[in-house]
Interface confidence: low
Amino acid sequence: SAPGEDEECGRVRDFVAKLANNTHQHVFDDLRGSVSLSWVGDSTGVILVLTTFHVPLVIMTFGQSKLYRSEDYGKNFKDITDLINNTFIRTEFGMAIGPENSGKVVLTAEVSGGSRGGRIFRSSDFAKNFVQTDLPFHPLTQMMYSPQNSDYLLALSTENGLWVSKNFGGKWEEIHKAVCLAKWGSDNTIFFTTYANGSCKADLGALELWRTSDLGKSFKTIGVKIYSFGLGGRFLFASVMADKDTTRRIHVSTDQGDTWSMAQLPSVGQEQFYSILAANDDMVFMHVDEPGDTGFGTIFTSDDRGIVYSKSLDRHLYTTTGGETDFTNVTSLRGVYITSVLSEDNSIQTMITFDQGGRWTHLRKPENSECDATAKNKNECSLHIHASYSISQKLNVPMAPLSEPNAVGIVIAHGSVGDAISVMVPDVYISDDGGYSWTKMLEGPHYYTILDSGGIIVAIEHSSRPINVIKFSTDEGQCWQTYTFTRDPIYFTGLASEPGARSMNISIWGFTESFLTSQWVSYTIDFKDILERNCEEKDYTAWLAHSTDPEDYEDGCILGYKEQFLRLRKSSVCQNGRDYVVTKQPSICLCSLEDFLCDFGYYRPENDSKCVEQPELKGHDLEFCLYGREEHLTTNGYRKIPGDKCQGGVNPVREVKDLKKKCTSNFLSPEKQNSKSN
């Protein structure tokens, strides 16, 4: 557990007056319909709110939307609907906010049936002004910004055309027809799949994967017989139909599709699927669906090339129907992921890994909790976390697990304590050490958010009745204080705080309902006066991440290095501040065989850390080929785990084997790769 001070609750004095002076109400002059909210830029304080209201008439639906803008984190809003000529904005497209702090916003308008194309409103000054632009096509998807240049936009049309703009939506050009899916890659590259015969659906498995690196001046076909493709980290993945049957297999490229390797993963049939659960520049977590409608599959983790995969977790819950998985990256601690497995008795259990998928384990039972009715042994059970699957099943779970990179070690989630996930009303649990230990934080379901990099946690009870009370904690959820933010309770619809958890403002959204009318209302509370002073050096304490056994000389070593953080003391009530940077001191660990995975053609026998050569690979389902053709491939049987930084210690050296003879692939032959120009 992270360093905790005394368990006594240090109360914040005079907090009611401090918060009352910093609570701002805004009543929106709108009928209740739907509301969507977007932050424009980082640390700008600019929020856009779009309210929409549908009036169902006999012949048509009359729609009305209003646009509001705040530049003080939601304390005050100004109606700017006139800037978009009082046009009805299509909510299914949302508000397309530009990357980084570009200040760009695109809103897609509803247009009448007979029009030649759609209409957008564009702003490049954080929504102070908008320019109306009529499009030469009807958009099918939201405008997608190039991550490298926010002036470059792409969109698909309802006619399956791929359209590109080079001047932030002012002018548009159709660069290709018959396009199913398009994505920006790195360096303003666009990847897209095309169909030749009927349609995207009809040609599934016979699509071509194309690439343009110059916004449509020239193209290269980089894949054929494509079912789908995806980008993750520096990897480009394509699932490709096999020659002989209806199975398909993953191929991977790390050079934007110029060369491909067959991933050492099982092939899948028509009813199965692959899913990239998480990816970074080092490696990828890949889910491979089990045959049949089982609702589970296997997680594999890749090597640094994305080619060789190690089985990470069996019976991983991933429903075919709703496409729900509980897989969660715990962003507050390196290497930690949480997900659910479907056990043999069809109960759902939570598993956690602290080493990027190397080993999975159950979550430790919280000290202050009893095992529930699902537990066979009342003294031995685990914490099980409610995530996407529970939410999809309409269990009383208002929020998925929450963690923030700058609130080191903190994870907040709904859960139940037993042998499996329970359908009973969950409680809220917190971990302050990245998931190693847990404590019950709040009774019953709540909405929660992290402010000031963990300096404040805010929660609101999930209730069907109107509410007027907010809870807050300044000691990572140990002690809570309640604040009545309004005399008149509201029907609560959501908590909103600026992404990144650096803000000290929280907005409570809801509506008031009276006999004749209902209106949207927001309350924005600024906690700056609760955290009166800036944190100083004495407010922080050293904490070794992943520490489980201080007597072990490799304590804290994960992926070859350990990290010591400076963390805010629980007893310190002070501001980390918007410019807070996590202070961490890494130190390299000695290598052991645990820091290596087995290369292609090698495996680890049960309970052995050594990689031994597979006697014969012929007839194996796991074919392998580097770059899609016979290649001189040499290996010593070991490969450093992606992202592992260990040095010294064990350096597995053994005879280098030539695996050329074991190389087979049925993917693109070079002659199928042709270049085309417009």
Epitope: A542, L544, S547, D549, P550, E551, D552, Y553, E554, D555, G556, K562, Q564, Q585, P586, S587, I588, C589, L590, C591, S592, L593, E594, D595, S609, Q647, G648, G649, V650
Partner: antibody, heavy 129, light 107 residues
Framework: QVQLVQSGAEVKKPGASVKVSCKAS????????MSWVRQAPGQGLEWMGI????????SYAQKFQGRVTMTRDTSTSTVYMELSSLRSEDTAVYYC??????????????????????WGQGTTVTVSS | EIVMTQSPATLSVSPGERATLSCRAS??????LAWYQQKPGQAPRLLIY???TRATGIPARFSGSGSGTEFTLTISSLQSEDFAVYYC?????????FGGGTKVEIK
Amino acid sequence: QVQLVQSGAEVKKPGASVKVSCKASGYTFTSRYMSWVRQAPGQGLEWMGIINPVGGSTSYAQKFQGRVTMTRDTSTSTVYMELSSLRSEDTAVYYCARDPSGIAAAGPASRYYYGMDVWGQGTTVTVSS
Amino acid sequence: EIVMTQSPATLSVSPGERATLSCRASQSVSSNLAWYQQKPGQAPRLLIYGASTRATGIPARFSGSGSGTEFTLTISSLQSEDFAVYYCQQARLGPWTFGGGTKVEIK
């Protein structure tokens, strides 16, 4: 009780190798590191290196790099120290010592150091032609 | 590597008297320091770890202090069984290093 039992005394010729064993009992072998320390006649203590029984990773003092090899056998809870290319100045008593902590390669030490809390009885190695 | 220097090399003390042994590190070792006692023909025995914490079974007359580069081992009232050689050892950065030792002899 916790104890480390070392192999018996050895007499070796210069240029030869010696392999000293250290068998642990009374605790979980893989839960603690093992250091090797030697003491030449009438001299002080000299740390040679450390091994992690879990993965077998090692760290050796620069002076012994290339001549010393530390290994372990988890099935018998035994750690071995082999010193090659022996010279007369390698004549010493060699101790294995349970070492609950280890090396912070960079930055502030991540935690408390608990000291070498259990020592073997020592193995006398004499190098003489 | 971090060099540990012990002083004095020999300390002559009468039984019942106080003995103060010093250990200096060439750079800060924080509190990652241990003290050992060694009697002739025996293996060393851990006395103090973490610069100031007595190991299990060590009498209260032994105490350690200091942090950073300066450390002290104090034996408040020497008993006959305390006459031995005492070593300090750092574990701040590899390689671990020992001081040259202080021999406490009967005056």
